[in-house]
Interface confidence: medium
């Protein structure tokens, strides 16, 4: 009874299509598959950034796989062939591993790469990234930003740089169609007459870096002798009401400070008849139903009521 063996896939490689971190892992079928013509061969693929403790594992029947990586580090991957038990009249058979690696040869010392990269997607409409020049780089150094996300044919360069002292220190992005809920890849590289500049790679999803506009049209309404309803409106833009959380700061008579987090555009406040002044501000953030993270908006303009009895039915109109 001869032992069934299968070869590893051939020509296993990692291909960089120029998408700033979105790489293709591809291979060819193993040699000598003739014995298993009636059998669907599967492949177990494992890959990771070098330095990561865990491997990502994929089982596929295809001859390719695509995923995003951190190009600041190297990538290692390994793959072997799997013959399911249905093909071998017994247990699953695995080939030996085929292995490959990929890295971008780094130019320049790490200190030359951009520092403090910060990207904010304002109101889910306008992406702005800013950075500081590398440590000790001269004014002749200039940085260039490139970006890609699935849906673009190729990586694009920033066309609207923010400058300081003649150096690019940020980028205002154009309208980014269908760009959220997918990985957004950025590379900032540089050039200098004096020394090579280290490239930096960044990956994030736009919905997780949204900073909304603050709420607008804050109003008060007396609901009962001891309750006041605070109301506001969502700011204009593409963010639907269901995506907002709000934080309120309420100050009564310059002393009591109440803070609360709510999901709706209203908040009911218990008050006493002695309250002479009431002020509140609100800020907004994209909630967990629409993103994994977010940035609080600026505080709204303060809305106050003072000098008259708060028991009036409607305080602002």
């Amino acid at each position: 009874d001869t032992e069934i063996k299968v070869n590893p896939p051939q020509d296993f490689e990692i291909v960089d299509p120029g998408y700033l971190g979105y790489l293709y892992l591809q291979w060819q079928p193993p040699l000598s598959l003739d014995h298993f013509k009636e059998c669907t061969v599967e492949y177990e693929l494992k890959y990771r950034n070098i330095g990561s403790e865990t491997w990502k594992t994929i089982i596929t029947k295809n001859l390719h796989y695509k995923d995003g990586f951190d190009l600041n580090k190297g990538i290692e991957a390994k793959i072997h062939t799997l013959l399911p038990w249905q093909c071998t009249n017994g247990s699953e058979v695995q080939s030996s591993w085929a292995e490959t690696t990929y890295w971008i040869s780094p130019q320049g010392i790490p200190e030359t790469k951009v520092q403090d990269m910060d990207c904010v997607y304002y109101n889910w409409q306008y992406l702005l990234c800013s950075w500081k020049p590398g440590i000790g780089v001269l004014l002749d150094t200039n940085y260039n930003l490139f970006y890609w996300y699935e849906g673009l044919d190729h990586a694009l360069q920033c066309v609207d740089y923010i400058k300081a002292d003649g150096q690019n220190i940020g980028c205002r992005f154009p309208y980014l169609e269908a760009s959220d809920y997918k990985d957004f890849y950025i590379c900032v590289n540089g050039s200098s007459e004096n020394k090579p500049i280290r490239s930096s790679y960044f990956t994030f999803q736009l919905q997780n870096i949204v900073k909304p506009l603050p709420p607008v049209y804050l109003t008060f309404t007396r609901e009962s002798s001891c309750e006041i309803k605070l109301k506001w409106s969502i700011p204009l833009g593409p963010i639907p009401a269901r995506c907002f959380d709000y934080e309120i700061e309420i100050r009564e008579d310059d002393t009591t400070l109440v803070t609360a987090t709510v999901e709706n555009e209203t908040y009911t406040l218990k008050t006493t008849n002695e309250t002479r002044q009431l002020c509140f501000v609100v800020r907004s953030k994209v909630n967990i139903y629409c993103s994994d993270d977010g940035i609080w908006s600026e505080w709204s303009d303060k809305q106050c009521w003072e000098g008259e009895d708060l028991s009036k039915k409607t305080l602002l109109r």
């Epitope: 409409q125 607008v216 049209y217 204009l236 833009g237 593409p238 303009d301 303060k302 809305q303």
Partner: antibody, heavy 119, light 111 residues
Amino acid sequence: QVQLVQSGAEVKKPGASVKVSCKASGYTFSNYLMNWVRQATGQGLEWMGRIDPYDGDIDYNQNFKDRVTITRNTSISTAYMELSSLRSEDTAVYYCARGYGTAYGVDYWGQGTLVTVSS
Amino acid sequence: EIVMTQSPATLSVSPGERATLSCRASESVDNYGISFMNWYQQKPGQAPRLLIYAASRQGSGIPARFSGSGSGTEFTLTISSLQSEDFAVYYCQQSKEVPWTFGGGTKLEIK
């Protein structure tokens, strides 16, 4: 509460100038655009221009051909509109009106100032 | 400049009925996915009052019977069930481009 209080009615001769003031209270003056709109008796509304009190940035309606000047004094939360080379067709009620931003319309209006131009 | 045209000039409706007012812009007033279109109500001797901003957002303290719709060049203000205090002149206004321009107004009168 938000209030925009305008200066009183004026009677002017043709060729003269008029300056209307608008004192804001109940909100942070520099956080909102201030617009000027006029309305001749029985007629519609005509936008004259706006100022951003925060930085003094101004947009004018070119139909007034450099006759209108909008200014502000943030220290006293007051906006001003001056119209020069007055003619009889400038007889109208002039309103100041606060706007949160370009897309938000104007949500609070002054009580209006009647300017009468007559010889 | 963008020319705003309102129709009809006068609309006669009975209390409790629905009123539909139209406004047409000479070119699109949409930008950034937002319609820069606002509606105001004006009663005799009073300043205008903001009803609707950005085509469909209700102004602060505006009753729910007032609603706005439309995009591009065609816009509608609907008052679902007319109350006696709703009889007034209504103006549309675009704020996409300077100069901001108003429609000529629609006078809503009791039938």
